[in-house]
């Protein structure tokens, strides 16, 4: 079975300093799947951030950058200039 494992349970972030979130795929090559990122905020709303092929949710393209680290089998989400409004729980997911 494949598994997507977040590299950190908690990521302390400084305002304005780029932050990187990573998910490691276990049991399969990440290149065989499309990676998606979501953010859950208060009220348990799950908001779409990014999907491979450079697809971003509304309002996310300017401050978020999704990538795949093929060599390390990682999905990567970079928050370019974090602010308080970026607080929340981030989830990676995959599909074919």
């Amino acid at each position: 079975a494949i598994e997507l494992v977040p590299e950190h349970q908690t990521v302390p972030v400084s305002i304005g300093v780029p932050a990187t979130l990573r998910c490691s795929m276990k049991g399969e090559a990440i290149g065989n799947y499309y990676i998606n990122w979501y953010r859950k905020t208060q009220g348990n709303t799950m908001t779409f951030i990014y999907r491979e092929k450079d697809i971003y949710g509304p309002g996310f393209k300017d401050n978020f950058q999704g990538d795949i680290d093929i060599a390390k089998n990682l999905a990567v989400l970079k928050i370019l200039a974090p602010s308080e409004r970026d607080e929340g729980s981030y989830y990676c997911a995959c599909d074919t």
């Epitope: 932050a19 990187t20 092929k53 450079d54 990538d67 795949i68 680290d69 093929i70 060599a71």
Partner: antibody, heavy 118, light 113 residues
Framework: EVQLVQSGAEVKKPGASVKVSCKAS????????LHWVRQAPGQGLEWVGW????????DYAQTFQGRVTMTRDTSISTAYMELSRLRSDDTAVYYC???????????WGQGTLVTVSS | DIVMTQSPDSLAVSLGERATINCKSS????????????LGWYQQKPGQPPKLLIY???TRESGVPDRFSGSGSGTDFTLTISSLQAEDVAVYFC?????????FGQGTKVDIK
């Protein structure tokens, strides 16, 4: 300002081990992979391996498997590379470099010259 | 392992002229899902560590002068210095980060003619 400061030059005999340190500052040490790359005198660049300072996970080039060990001390934001069973062709400048993006080396240490000679 | 081969090994160019360095990978470093080439370029001056110039084959690192540009896709890549300056005298390396082990080209030495 991101800085990687390495330990000083070493002279070792064949068969010995060397341990090089790399102290990081100016960024979150546990947030980014740290690599070691070496360069023999007048030669090109050769990737040795990486360490994930957060988890301690490592991956080494096949060439160095069994001879290299990468470790870190997160309390002092320092990474270490130990190379054992040294040979004369291990004489090189060893660089640490961090990877703030994906796969490329954004910042480099000043390099540590390791000379292996009898 | 992916083998990176640069050409030429060295070149001499007049100040203000164009310098072109080629890099060929033994297999493609293009990932079709994101259409990105996992290739970088570095500059190394004597006695100094390498400095990142370009990543994703064509994206300039911040602070790098715009006379440096990268192009190419798949297995064939080029670093171009549009108007060579005295401070550009250095050795230039390409590097693939598509698969482990990461590998570098052998380097191209750029001098002033």
């Amino acid at each position: 300002e991101v800085q990687l400061v390495q330990s000083g030059a070493e002279v070792k005999k064949p068969g010995a081990s060397v341990k090089v340190s790399c102290k990081a500052s100016g960024y979150t040490f546990t947030g980014y992979y740290l690599h070691w790359v070496r360069q023999a005198p007048g030669q090109g660049l050769e990737w040795v391996g990486w360490i994930n300072p957060s988890s301690g996970d490592t991956d080494y080039a096949q060439t160095f498997q069994g001879r290299v060990t990468m470790t870190r001390d997160t309390s002092i934001s320092t990474a270490y590379m130990e190379l054992s069973r040294l040979r004369s062709d291990d004489t090189a400048v060893y660089y640490c470099a961090n990877e703030l993006g994906i796969g490329v080396f954004d910042y480099w240490g000043q390099g540590t010259l390791v000379t292996v000679s009898s | 392992d992916i083998v990176m081969t640069q050409s030429p090994d060295s070149l001499a160019v007049s100040l203000g002229e164009r310098a072109t360095i080629n890099c060929k990978s033994s297999q493609s470093v293009l990932y079709s899902s994101n259409n990105k080439n996992y290739l970088g370029w570095y500059q190394q001056k004597p006695g100094q560590p390498p400095k990142l110039l370009i990543y994703w084959a064509s994206t300039r690192e911040s602070g790098v002068p715009d006379r440096f540009s990268g192009s190419g896709s798949g297995t064939d890549f080029t670093l171009t210095i549009s108007s060579l300056q005295a401070e550009d005298v250095a050795v230039y390396f390409c590097q693939q980060y598509y698969s482990i082990p990461y590998t570098f080209g052998q380097g191209t030495k750029v001098d002033i003619k």
